[in-house]
């Protein structure tokens, strides 16, 4: 969490955003709020990126105002309108690009005064890995798959009855690239399972961390998965 | 005020380059990109490219990709645009301009006839 | 690459008249449209930025149009007016221009 105040005194407000990630392809929020006003007119709320010369939004006198976005944002961003005289002035961002990633400042004037704060922004590929007894292999085998990671991400595998134990020398993970050239497709297969223990195949990159577990006993296979963005702090 | 000055014209051969320059005075040179537009004589305006003066990083017209190279100098703050492999159909004005969606100013134009 | 059309690329007329020039772009463009004036050995000039934001020309030019269809009109042509006039798309690179238009004494 980043909490930022204005630079003058009794001019200042405190603006409060969060890092986050964004799945490449898909749509993410840049989260940022600040001390409300009475007024919607007279709160302007402007987006910015480092490095980025033109706007990433501005929204002013309760409407969007684009005509100085940068191109690389064109058609693409969007604020919660009916919840900027709240205080929301939390940004949706359409189609996250790998270049969207980067230092974003969430700018605010009110009537009350002006504030800012930053928000690293991360982008990458993640996915729910599921779990699969792979019942066409000659041994007890078990198959995760997770259809988009980027960066290339590690795979880890454990188990409940062996914990600690290292599963690296019976297990094979490989990564495929998909169409869009970009993110992967991550398979990884455990070889020599055993019955009535549970089972956890771990895919982690610097953005995410996801879990798929699977239980097989001679009754039933349970399933679960998971996923946990990474470094989501507030400023 | 705001200011882009261009170097002077020049004269090329086929299959040589060309280097010109763009001196920005008058406000923040990383505050605005900076943008090359051509027009061969008798003719319309054509967009070359652009270069963000803070991080270096370009986009260039597809017709162009390969043979033209923008830079820039932010001790100086100019930025220089080169096109190689001269031909005969280069033979035109080339303008700098500063902007984000629009342009302005735009330099006095630099003449680039090549000839052999 | 977004086209931009022009028309007419050529337009006799007398001061005093009302001049209408217009740009079309072949996909929706917004209001990314900007409108410049060149006279002959010179740089282009900014008029008319986001379709219909005067910069600093006097107020007989005007712009307007949204999505693919764009004017731009003077509502009396005065003599420092003759000149070639263009537009151009700035909602994604590379930023086209339309072919121009030449605005001639009748």
């Known amino acids: 969490l980043i909490i930022g105040f204005g630079i003058s005194g009794r001019h200042s407000i405190t603006v409060t955003t969060v890092a986050s990630a964004g799945n490449i392809g898909e749509d993410g929020i840049l989260s940022c709020t600040f001390e409300p006003d009475i007024k919607l007119s007279d709160i302007v709320i402007q987006w910015l990126k480092e490095g980025v010369l033109g706007l990433v939004h501005e929204f002013k006198e309760g409407k969007d105002e684009l005509s100085e976005q940068d191109e690389m944002f064109r058609g693409r961003t969007a604020v919660f309108a009916d919840q900027v005289i709240v205080g929301n002035a939390s940004l949706r961002l359409k189609n996250v690009q790998l270049t969207d990633a980067g230092t974003y400042k969430c700018y605010i004037i009110t009537s009350k005064g002006k504030g800012n704060a930053n928000l690293e922004y991360k982008t990458g590929a993640f996915s729910m890995p599921e779990v699969n007894v792979d019942y066409n292999a000659s041994s007890e085998t078990l198959r995760c798959e997770a259809p988009r990671w980027f960066p290339q991400p590690t795979v880890v595998w454990a188990s409940q009855v062996d914990q600690g134990a290292n599963f690296s020398e019976v297990s094979n993970t490989s990564f495929e690239l998909n169409s869009e050239n970009v993110t992967m497709k991550v398979v990884s297969v455990l070889y020599n399972v055993t019955i009535n223990n549970t089972y956890s195949c771990m895919i982690e990159n610097d953005i995410a961390k996801a879990t798929g577990d699977i239980k097989v006993t001679e009754s039933e296979i349970k399933r679960r998965s998971h996923l946990q963005l990474l470094n989501s702090k507030a400023s | 005020q705001v200011q882009l000055v261009q170097s002077g014209a020049e004269v090329k051969k086929p299959g040589a380059s060309v280097k010109v320059s763009c001196k920005a005075s008058?406000?923040?040179?990383?505050?605005?990109?900076m943008y090359w537009v051509r027009q061969a004589p008798g003719q319309g305006l054509e967009w070359m490219g652009r270069i963000n003066p803070t991080s270096g990083n370009t986009v260039y017209a597809q017709k162009l990709q390969g043979r033209v190279t923008m830079t820039r100098d932010t001790s100086t703050s100019t930025v220089y645009m080169e096109l190689s492999s001269l031909r005969s159909e280069d033979t035109a004005v080339y303008y700098c301009a500063r902007g984000i969606n629009w342009f302005d100013p735009w330099g006095q134009g630099t003449l680039v006839t090549v000839s052999s | 690459d977004i086209q931009m059309t022009q028309s007419p690329s050529s337009l006799s007329a007398s001061v005093g008249d009302r001049v209408t020039i217009t740009c079309r772009a072949s996909q929706n463009i917004d209001t990314y449209v900007n409108w410049y004036q060149q006279k002959p050995g010179k740089a282009p000039k900014l008029l008319i930025y986001a379709a219909s934001r005067l910069h600093t020309v006097p107020s007989r030019f005007s712009g307007s149009g949204s999505g693919t269809d764009f004017t731009l009109t003077i509502s009396s042509l005065q003599p420092e007016d003759f000149a070639t006039y263009y537009c151009?798309?700035?909602?994604?690179?590379?930023?086209?221009f339309g072919g121009g238009t030449k605005v001639e004494i009748k």
């Open positions: 151009q798309q700035s909602y994604t690179s590379p930023f086209t």
């Open positions: 008058g406000y923040t040179f990383t505050a605005q990109y």
